[in-house]
Amino acid sequence: FPMFKRGRCLCIGPGVKAVKVADIEKASIMYPSNNCDKIEVIITLKENKGQRCLNPKSKQARLIIKKVERKNF
């Protein structure tokens, strides 16, 4: 049922390659689950500019994931 699981992901499309660091309010990582079969990196932008999905394969996303994992474990 991969299509069903993918249909419930928060990010649609591949995500942006990068977000200006100065614009980032916070970063959230959603790990694969029953709802979505892929890792998702969601950036909350400053000044109520909404949220963006970051391409989890991008260099910036990999750095964020590493940073968050170091912090949590």
Epitope: M3, G7, I12, P14, V16
Partner: nanobody, 130 residues
Framework: EVQLVESGGGLVQAGGSLRLSCAAA?????????ISWFRQAPGKDREFVAA???????????EYADSVKGRFTISRDNAKNTAYLEMNSLKFEDTAVYYC???????????????????WGQGTQVTVSS
């Protein structure tokens, strides 16, 4: 950088049809872009009309504002890097400037929010006369 150019607007009688086009000047990842149409009537806020996004497989999903459901259809031709908004049974209330927007990093729950999109066209005027 994606540049979007809308066309196809004009003056039409109530009950008539129009087809708006949104051409992306630099294709690149057009296939995977979430494409949305918004509209803005004089003195009103920009409002969501329709969106279409890549399923991650070979199909697209679409979502519509309640006010246009069953009358408007969003589609795209990736070979031409162009998205379309087919508008049927037009009403006087559909009069507005129509904008297309594109983004690669759209969050599913925020698809109707203008701030979710990175690229915008200049708009095309649609006037429906009664």
């Amino acid at each position: 950088e994606v540049q979007l150019v809308e066309s196809g607007g004009g003056l039409v009688q109530a009950g008539g049809s129009l087809r708006l086009s949104c051409a992306a000047a630099s294709g690149g990842t057009f296939t995977k872009q979430t494409i949305s149409w918004f509209r803005q009537a004089p003195g009103k806020d920009r409002e969501f009309v329709a969106a279409q996004w890549w399923s991650g497989l070979s199909t697209y999903f679409a979502e519509y504002a309640d006010s246009v459901k069953g009358r408007f259809t969003i589609s795209r031709d990736n070979a031409k890097n162009t998205a379309y908004l087919e508008m049927n049974s037009l009403k006087f209330e559909d009069t507005a400037v129509y904008y297309c927007a594109a983004g690669l990093g759209v969050v599913r729950t925020l698809i109707r929010r203008a701030s979710s999109y990175d690229y915008w066209g200049q708009g095309t005027q649609v006037t429906v006369s009664s």
